[in-house]
């Protein structure tokens, strides 16, 4: 039995990366720990070194292969273990049977760009990164726009219920600086969660033409 409260959470990016976080109350800060991945039906296994992210939390990325290679399928089950060094031996601190396509978190969308901007609207596009071809078009997106004087948390969420890698923002204020972010989630997976937000895209609406009602 492991002393204290332990939590071991991992997500698959749908291609060649499993990211894990392990938190353990009362764990020793100077102990060397790693995550070991052992698929049930593959010839390879993989290890990554857990690095501290807070007082009682460690994280690491299992790199399974080339970023766009399909290293696991929906039938695979991966045994994930947290192993910590105790003298000359490794002790199992946490273990889970991990179904990769039930625990998905995709990479943040990339390549955000302004396609067209006017006084009151702006058309923005983006791309998804390292997402499996398994999903076909069955992805959804959330987007948010940061207005002057507001925080990201206050920004209303816009939901796109299909694989649509663009958005037309309406009812914007002329000659105003905005920022825009988007995130993605597959429909597949009981424990699937949203990707991180993309890097913000800054844009400015065009000024209203003088003497004209726009």
């Amino acid at each position: 039995a492991v002393n204290g409260t332990s939590q071991f959470t991992c997500f698959y990016n749908s291609r060649a990366n499993i990211s894990c976080v392990w938190s353990q109350d009362g764990a020793l800060q100077d102990t060397s720990c790693q995550v070991h991945a052992w698929p049930d039906r593959r010839r390879w296994n993989q290890t990554c070194e857990l690095l501290p992210v807070s007082q009682a939390s460690w994280a690491c990325n299992l790199i399974l292969g080339a970023p766009d290679s399909q290293k696991l399928t929906t039938v695979d089950i991966v045994t994930l273990r947290v192993l910590c060094r105790e003298g000359v031996r490794w002790r199992v601190m946490a273990i889970q049977d991990f179904k990769p396509f039930e625990n998905l978190r995709l990479m943040a969308p990339i390549s955000l760009q302004v396609v067209h901007v006017e006084t009151h609207r702006c058309n923005i596009s983006w791309e998804i990164s390292q997402a499996s071809h398994y999903f076909e078009r069955h992805l959804e997106f959330e987007a948010r726009t940061l207005s002057p004087g507001h925080t990201w948390e206050e920004a209303p969420l816009l939901t796109l219920k299909q694989k649509q890698e663009w958005i037309c923002l309406e009812t914007l204020t002329p000659d105003t600086q905005y920022e825009f972010q988007v995130r993605v989630k597959p429909l597949q997976g009981e424990f699937t969660t949203w990707s991180p937000w993309s890097q913000p895209l800054a844009f400015r609406t065009k000024p209203a033409a003088l003497g004209k009602d726009t």
């Epitope: 290679s69 399909q70 399928t73 929906t74 039938v75 396509f101 039930e102 071809h133 398994y134 999903f135 076909e136 069955h138 429909l187 597949q188 009981e190």
Partner: antibody
Framework: EVQLVQSGAEVKKPGATVKISCKVS????????MHWVQQAPGKGLEWMGW????????EYAPGFQDRVTITADTSTDTAYMELSSLRSEDTAVYYC??????????WGQGTTVTVSS | EIVMTQSPATLSVSPGERATLSCRAS??????LHWYQQKPGQAPRLLII???QSISGIPARFSGSGSGTEFTLTISSLQSEDFAVYFC?????????FGQGTKLEIK
Amino acid sequence: EVQLVQSGAEVKKPGATVKISCKVSGFNFKDSLMHWVQQAPGKGLEWMGWIDSENGETEYAPGFQDRVTITADTSTDTAYMELSSLRSEDTAVYYCARGGPWFLSYWGQGTTVTVSS
Amino acid sequence: EIVMTQSPATLSVSPGERATLSCRASQIISNNLHWYQQKPGQAPRLLIIYGLQSISGIPARFSGSGSGTEFTLTISSLQSEDFAVYFCQQSNNWPWTFGQGTKLEIK
């Protein structure tokens, strides 16, 4: 327009092998999963397996894995299903289909295979 | 192997009325449940994925619900073209398995 066109009906003797083709158009075959499903009169729909055309990996259902081989020719955008050691209970309609691993978005028209001595 | 049981085997409903088809899984499958329609002499057609998500191009009268082991396909107002066989399919445990089908016929 997505299309999956299967080869014609076959009549085979018990113990023989049948190979059905599925020619696709209207989508990128090289990043698709191609599936095969059996629909036998008394047994309903049974998933036989799939091939990932991106990397050639296959997955077979346990009930078929000893006798079925699924292949894909990316130069002609054609998937194949070969079923060996045929018996009378293999008399069925066989469908190819395209989809992610979890469900089947587009289907071929079906190929009837009759196994009879 | 997960066994999918559909009920009833045959359902007789008048055009314009509502039809409710049931599908039960032999173990918990979360929302990994999909519905198909098959007309005589044709291949099945995908209607609903993950229990409740409609496929684009499918009429809004088709809706799905349920999670865990009990699922329902509802057709709110039956049209003549809706009379067909309906199959459910699970994708929680390989091999994926289908129900035996519910035949929806004109009353």
